[in-house]
C-alpha cells in the first residue's frame, strides 16, 4: 500500500529499523546513541547553512515474538514485518536506515516499491550488489573480492614477486555475519574471485585446515580465513606450519591492531591481516569510548547514515528540489560527504569505499606493521613497507604453489 512520507513542510523524518536480528551482537542502545549523535550534528550543519528545518528519527522496534534468534538467520521476515508495521501506522520517513542483515535487506528490497532510499550498516552479500536505492556503509563482499584478486595478481613489489592463482578458503559455518558473506562470495563459483583463480578449494572442517598446514601435497600455500586472532588460535593453536604457508586473515572491522601496546602473538607470524584503516581520531573519540574495537564500525555506520541523509537533504533543499521523489531516492551514490571522522566516499552503486590495510607481524618487534594499503575506490594497491621483516624466506612472500619457479 502507498505509505505517506513524513518528509515535507520543513519537517524531515528518518525511519530507523531497530531489529533484534543484527549483523553484529551490538546492544541497541549503542545504535540509538549513534543515531541521536548523528541527528545533533545534522541539525547543526543545516542550521549553519541557513536551513531552518526539523530533522528527527523514529525508531521502529521489532516485537521480537517470532524472530528471536538474535542473529541474521531469522531476519528475512523480520524486516518485512517492520515494513508492514510502518505501512499500518502510515508512518514512513524520508529514508530508511537498517536493516543490516543481507537476508532481510535483499527481501525488503525485493518486496517493496522503493521510492525512498535505504541505508544499511551491513548487507555484505553479493545479492545486495547493484541495488539502485540501497546504500551500504560497511565494506561489502564485492570490495574484498576486488582487493584479493588485485593482490593475487600483483608481482612487482619487492616483497611479492610472484602472482598467485590458487587458494584455500576456510569456511566452517560458524562465522559472524560479515565473515559469512565475505567467504560466501569467495566460495561462489560464479564470483569474480573464482573466475580469476585457477584453483580454489573450500576447507570446511578444522582437521582439513590443520592438515593443510604441513601437507607436502597441498595445492596452494595460501589460505584465506575470516575472523580475529583468537579465532585463528582456536583453530591452529601452536601447531607447526610449513615455512611457505601464508594465511590471509580477513578482519576488517577490528581496530585492535592499531591500539597502543598491542603485541602480535607468536601464532600470527605466518599471517597477513586484512583490516580497515582506522579513522584519524576515532580510537580516542567520545563516540567510540564505550564501544569495543570490533563494534565501532557498526555504530559508526549508523551515525554516518544519518550524516549522509543530512548531506543529501541539504543539497536538495538548497536546490529547491523535492525530497519525496525517485531522484532523491537514487541520489545516495557517487558522492563524498563529511562523515563523523572525515570524508566518506560512495561508489556508483552506493557502496562505501575505504582504505584496506594489509598487516604483517614483524619478527623483530612482534608488532603489527602495515605492509600495504589498498584504495577500493580506484582498485589500486600502495606498498608501504618496502623491506618488511617477514617470517618468510628472504623477506618475500612465497609462491602460492610450492616448487614453482618465478612467474
Amino acid at each position: 500500500s502507498q505509505v505517506s512520507q513524513n518528509c515535507h513542510n520543513g519537517s524531515y523524518e528518518i525511519s530507523v529499523l531497530m531489529m533484534g536480528n543484527s549483523a553484529f551482537a551490538e546492544p541497541l542502545k549503542n545504535l540509538e546513541d549513534a543515531v541521536n549523535e548523528g541527528l545533533e550534528i545534522v541539525r547543526g550543519r543545516l542550521q549553519n547553512a541557513g536551513l531552518n528545518v526539523t530533522v528527527n528519527a523514529t525508531f521502529m522496534y521489532s516485537d521480537g515474538l517470532i524472530h528471536n534468534s538474535g542473529d541474521c538467520r531469522s531476519s528475512t521476515c523480520e524486516g518485512l514485518d517492520l515494513l508492514r508495521k510502518i505501512s499500518n501506522a502510515q508512518r514512513m520517513g524520508c529514508v530508511l536506515i537498517g536493516p543490516s542483515c543481507t537476508y532481510s535487506t535483499f527481501q525488503m528490497y525485493l518486496d517493496t516499491e522503493l521510492s525512498y532510499p535505504m541505508i544499511s550498516a551491513g548487507s555484505f552479500g553479493l545479492s545486495c550488489d547493484y541495488k539502485e536505492t540501497l546504500t551500504r556503509l560497511m565494506s561489502p563482499a564485492r570490495k574484498l573480492m576486488y582487493f584479493l584478486v588485485n593482490f593475487w595478481k600483483t608481482n612487482d613489489l619487492p616483497f611479492k614477486t610472484y602472482s598467485w592463482s590458487t587458494s584455500y578458503v576456510y569456511k566452517n559455518g560458524t562465522e559472524t555475519e560479515d565473515c559469512f558473506w565475505y567467504l560466501n562470495a569467495l566460495e561462489a563459483s560464479v564470483s569474480y574471485f573464482s573466475h580469476e583463480l585457477g584453483f580454489k578449494v573450500v576447507l570446511r572442517q578444522d582437521k582439513e585446515f590443520q592438515d593443510i598446514l604441513m601437507d607436502h601435497n597441498r595445492k596452494s600455500n595460501v589460505i584465506i580465513m575470516c575472523g580475529g586472532p583468537e579465532f585463528l588460535y582456536k583453530l591452529k593453536g601452536d601447531r607447526a606450519v610449513a615455512e611457505d604457508i601464508v594465511i590471509i586473515l580477513v578482519d576488517l572491522f577490528n581496530d585492535q591492531y592499531f591500539e597502543d601496546n598491542v603485541t602480535a602473538p607468536d601464532y600470527m607470524k605466518n599471517v597477513l591481516v586484512l583490516t580497515l584503516s582506522p579513522g584519524n581520531s576515532l580510537l580516542n573519540s567520545s563516540f567510540s569510548r564505550n564501544l569495543s574495537p570490533t563494534k565501532r564500525d557498526f555504530a559508526l555506520a549508523y551515525l554516518n547514515g544519518i550524516l549522509l541523509f543530512g548531506h543529501m537533504l541539504k543539497i536538495f533543499l538548497e536546490n529547491g528540489e523535492n525530497i519525496t521523489t525517485p531522484k532523491f531516492a537514487h541520489a545516495f551514490r557517487n558522492l563524498t560527504f563529511e562523515g563523523y571522522d572525515g570524508p566518506v566516499t560512495l561508489d556508483d552503486w552506493g557502496d562505501v569505499d575505504s582504505t584496506m590495510v594489509l598487516l604483517y607481524t614483524s619478527v623483530d618487534t612482534k608488532k603489527y606493521k602495515v605492509l600495504l594499503t589498498y584504495d577500493t575506490h580506484v582498485n589500486k594497491t600502495y606498498p608501504v613497507d618496502m623491506s618488511p621483516t617477514f617470517t618468510w624466506k628472504n623477506s618475500k612472500l612465497p609462491n602460492d604453489i610450492t616448487g614453482r619457479g618465478p612467474q
Epitope: M18, G20, A25, P27, L28, K29, N30, E32, D33, N36, E37, E40, F59, Y61, S62, D63, G64, L65, N68, S69, G70, S286, F287, R289, N290, S292
Partner: antibody, heavy 118, light 110 residues
Framework: CQSVKESGGGLFKPTDTLTLTCTVS????????MNWVRQTPGKGLEWIAI???????YYASWAKSRSTITRNTSENTVTLKMTSLTAADTATYFC????????????WGPGTLVTISS | AYDMTQTPASVEVAVGGTVTIKCQAS??????LAWYQQKPGQSPKPLIY???TLASGVSSRFRGSGSGTQFTLTISGVECADAATYYC????????????FGGGTEVVVK
C-alpha cells in the same frame, strides 16, 4: 576513590517540581552514562532516565513528559528535574553510573528519600 | 517494550541450599543482562553482567546463565548473608522502555 551522591530529597507537595542533584567524584562524566533509578517503599527498582557521555538523553516512557535529565561536566553533577509530582512519586531516588562498556550499573549512590504529601 | 519478568517473587531456602531465580525478557536481548543484590536500607550491589560474568569481588557461589530471552541466577551454598532482594536488568536498549528492571525476587534464608 570513585563515588556518587544524591541530594535534594525531602518533603514536597503534590504538583510541586522536584530537582535532584547527583554529585560525582573520582571519574569524568564524559566517560560514562549516568542514570536515575527510583524505588518506592517496599517495591522494586524503576529506571527513570539516562544521560550519555555525549549528553544524549533517554527516559522511561512514563517519565518522558515530565522529567528532564541534564549534566554539568565542570561541576561534576547530573540533575533530574521532575514536574507535576503526585503521591506515587514518593520513593528513594538513586543515581547510578553505567560502567564504561555499558554492561551494568557499577556504582550507585546511597539514595535520597523524596516524600510527596499534602 | 523490552519488559523483564522475574520469578518467583519470593523464595525460601535453607542455609547451604541452592536457589534459582529466573528472568524473562519480552524479546531477545542477547546477553545484555545484569543481576543486582539489594539489602534493606542499602543501594543495589552488582553481582553479574553480560548474563554470566561475575562483577568484581562477587563470590563464585553466584552464577548467571542464559541468553536471548531466558536467564537464570543460581546461588549455591546459600549463606545467611545472601538474604536480600535480587533484580535482573536488561542493558540492551535505552529508548523503548517502561522500566528495564525485573520486579525483584526476595530470598529468605531459613
Amino acid at each position: 576513590c570513585q563515588s556518587v551522591k544524591e541530594s535534594g530529597g525531602g518533603l514536597f507537595k503534590p504538583t510541586d517540581t522536584l530537582t535532584l542533584t547527583c554529585t560525582v567524584s573520582g571519574f569524568s562524566l564524559s566517560s560514562h552514562r549516568m542514570n536515575w533509578v527510583r524505588q518506592t517503599p517496599g517495591k522494586g527498582l524503576e529506571w527513570i532516565a539516562i544521560i550519555t557521555h555525549n549528553s544524549i538523553t533517554y527516559y522511561a516512557s512514563w517519565a518522558k513528559s515530565r522529567s528532564t535529565i541534564t549534566r554539568n561536566t565542570s561541576e561534576n553533577t547530573v540533575t533530574l528535574k521532575m514536574t507535576s509530582l503526585t503521591a506515587a512519586d514518593t520513593a528513594t531516588y538513586f543515581c547510578a553510573r553505567e560502567d564504561s562498556m555499558g554492561y551494568y550499573f557499577d556504582l550507585w549512590g546511597p539514595g535520597t528519600l523524596v516524600t510527596i504529601s499534602s | 517494550a523490552y519488559d523483564m519478568t522475574q520469578t518467583p517473587a519470593s523464595v525460601e531456602v535453607a542455609v547451604g541450599g541452592t536457589v534459582t531465580i529466573k528472568c524473562q525478557a519480552s524479546q531477545s536481548i542477547s546477553n545484555w543482562l545484569a543481576w543486582y543484590q539489594q539489602k534493606p536500607g542499602q543501594s543495589p550491589k552488582p553481582l553479574i553482567y553480560r548474563a554470566s560474568t561475575l562483577a568484581s569481588g562477587v563470590s563464585s557461589r553466584f552464577r548467571g546463565s542464559g541468553s536471548g530471552t531466558q536467564f537464570t541466577l543460581t546461588i549455591s551454598g546459600v549463606e545467611c548473608a545472601d538474604a536480600a532482594t535480587y533484580y535482573c536488568q536488561q542493558t540492551y536498549t535505552n529508548n523503548h522502555l517502561d522500566n528495564g528492571f525485573g520486579g525483584g525476587t526476595e530470598v529468605v534464608v531459613k
